[in-house]
């Protein structure tokens, strides 16, 4: 906290400019008018104030706006945004995408901070849903943003926003998140033809049910092994050898390298060895010939 002292003669700031970097903290406190600072916030970003000097400028704004800053000031905070706490940000009402972009730009190239997370949360809640423009903006700055949301939060993403999602945006999503996103993607891309549809839906297939995988196997999609390995195990298990062969096309040979990993390992255990042998890949671990396979889950459902 800077002590209240009178501004030395001739040092009263008439505008926010570079000369202020030579002011000591107490001089900034005494000589810079908070209202002037608020109206000329856009200049602060170009001035190499120290971290400590920015503390003083923040303090002045806090005194001027104890209930939270107006958006006209927020949009021009620049590096002063780095001084804000999540508690400060919760007082804001940010409605403009331009304001959001301006503040995300300040943190560009750095990990998502608690301040940024709070800002995004406030913005999205204010909008009521994660619309396409917002999602476009957020994933441009933070490719992993979507995967940081809970399944509940993802449920507010309208299918139209899915067009903004790039494959890398889903890299860190877990199956629960893909379970929510996949149906939205299926809806969003439903009017595309086979090959184009597959290109778009591919990244979301970690949430696809068995029946959709069966349908894809009839479309000569040639799914790569990386995509196959991300499929839900419970969705892969019911697929026949013939269906997997059709699904993977020329990539089926890759199964051998993955035979010890899920979901391939579990799928092999469910297939007849005879059927696996038809692939000519030397896959081992299938059900020996002459054995009867009982589906216990079906039996439990009936009893």
């Amino acid at each position: 906290e800077v002590e209240k002292t009178a501004c030395p003669s001739g040092k009263k700031a008439r505008e926010i400019d570079e000369s202020l970097i030579f002011y000591k903290k107490w001089e900034l406190e005494a000589c810079v008018d908070a209202a002037l600072l608020a109206t000329q916030m856009d200049r602060v970003n170009a001035i190499p104030f120290t971290y400590e000097q920015l503390d003083v400028l923040k303090h002045k704004l806090d005194e001027l706006y104890p209930q939270g800053y107006p958006e006209s000031v927020i949009q021009h905070l620049g590096y002063l945004f780095l001084k804000m706490s999540p508690e400060d940000i919760r007082k804001w009402n940010v409605t403009s995408l331009e304001t959001l972009k301006a503040l995300l730009e300040v943190n560009k190239g750095h990990e998502m901070s608690p301040q940024v997370a709070t800002l995004i949360d406030r913005f999205v809640k204010g909008r009521g849903q994660l619309d396409k423009d917002t999602l476009d903006t957020l994933t441009a700055f933070y490719p992993g943003y979507l995967c940081s949301l809970s399944p509940e939060e993802l449920s507010s993403v309208p299918p139209s926003s899915i067009w903004a999602v790039r494959p890398q945006d889903l890299d860190t999503c877990d199956p629960r998140q893909l379970d929510v996103l996949y149906p939205k993607a299926r809806l969003a891309f439903q009017n595309m033809n086979g090959s184009e549809y597959f290109v778009k839906i591919q990244s979301f297939l970690g949430g696809a049910p068995t029946e959709d995988l069966k349908a894809l196997s009839q479309q000569n999609v040639s799914m790569d092994l990386a995509t196959f390995m991300k499929l839900r195990t419970d969705a892969v298990l019911p697929l026949t050898v013939a269906e997997v062969q059709k699904l993977l096309g020329p990539h089926v040979e890759g199964l051998k390298a993955e035979e010890r990993h899920r979901p391939v390992r579990d799928w092999i255990l469910r297939q007849r060895q005879d059927d696996l042998d038809t692939l000519g890949l030397g896959l081992q671990g299938g059900i020996p010939n002459g054995y009867l396979v009982l589906d216990l889950s079906m039996q439990e459902a009936l009893s």
Epitope: E18, I47, P48, Y51, L54, Y79, L82
Partner: nanobody
Framework: QVQPVESGGGLVQPGGSLRLSCVVS????????MAWYRQASGKERESVAF????????LYLDSVRGRFTISRDIYKKTVYLQMDNLKPEDTGVYYC??????????WGQGTQVTVSS
């Protein structure tokens, strides 16, 4: 944020000269105004010289004006501080930084300047 690397400090007698250099690699050097700062033992860090991103606007702390000269070479991504007629009160660790670096509190090691007879 890439840390600046300062050099050129040393022990010099009053009235002597030093030329400090600061290399800022890895950042978009031409995008930012730069400043030299100094911190004397137990004191607040203070700005001593400023140069705008185009090099046209140059400002100095009152106590160094006429003795210090700041300049920048955009091709070498280097900022210089020529210090002449040095005084004992110029003693301290000298740092350079840009607005993003200073705001994030990311500093180099600095270079020690000692003015003493």
């Amino acid at each position: 944020q890439v840390q600046p690397v300062e050099s050129g400090g040393g022990l010099v007698q009053p009235g002597g000269s030093l030329r400090l250099s600061c290399v800022v690699s890895g950042s978009d050097f031409t995008e930012d105004a730069m400043a030299w700062y100094r911190q004397a033992s137990g004191k607040e860090r203070e700005s001593v010289a400023f140069v705008s991103k185009d090099g046209k606007r140059i400002l100095y702390l009152d106590s160094v004006r006429g003795r210090f000269t700041i300049s920048r070479d955009i091709y070498k991504k280097t900022v210089y501080l020529q210090m002449d007629n040095l005084k004992p009160e110029d003693t301290g660790v000298y740092y350079c930084n840009s607005a993003p670096g200073a705001a994030r509190n990311v500093w180099g090691q600095g270079t020690q300047v000692t003015v003493s007879s």
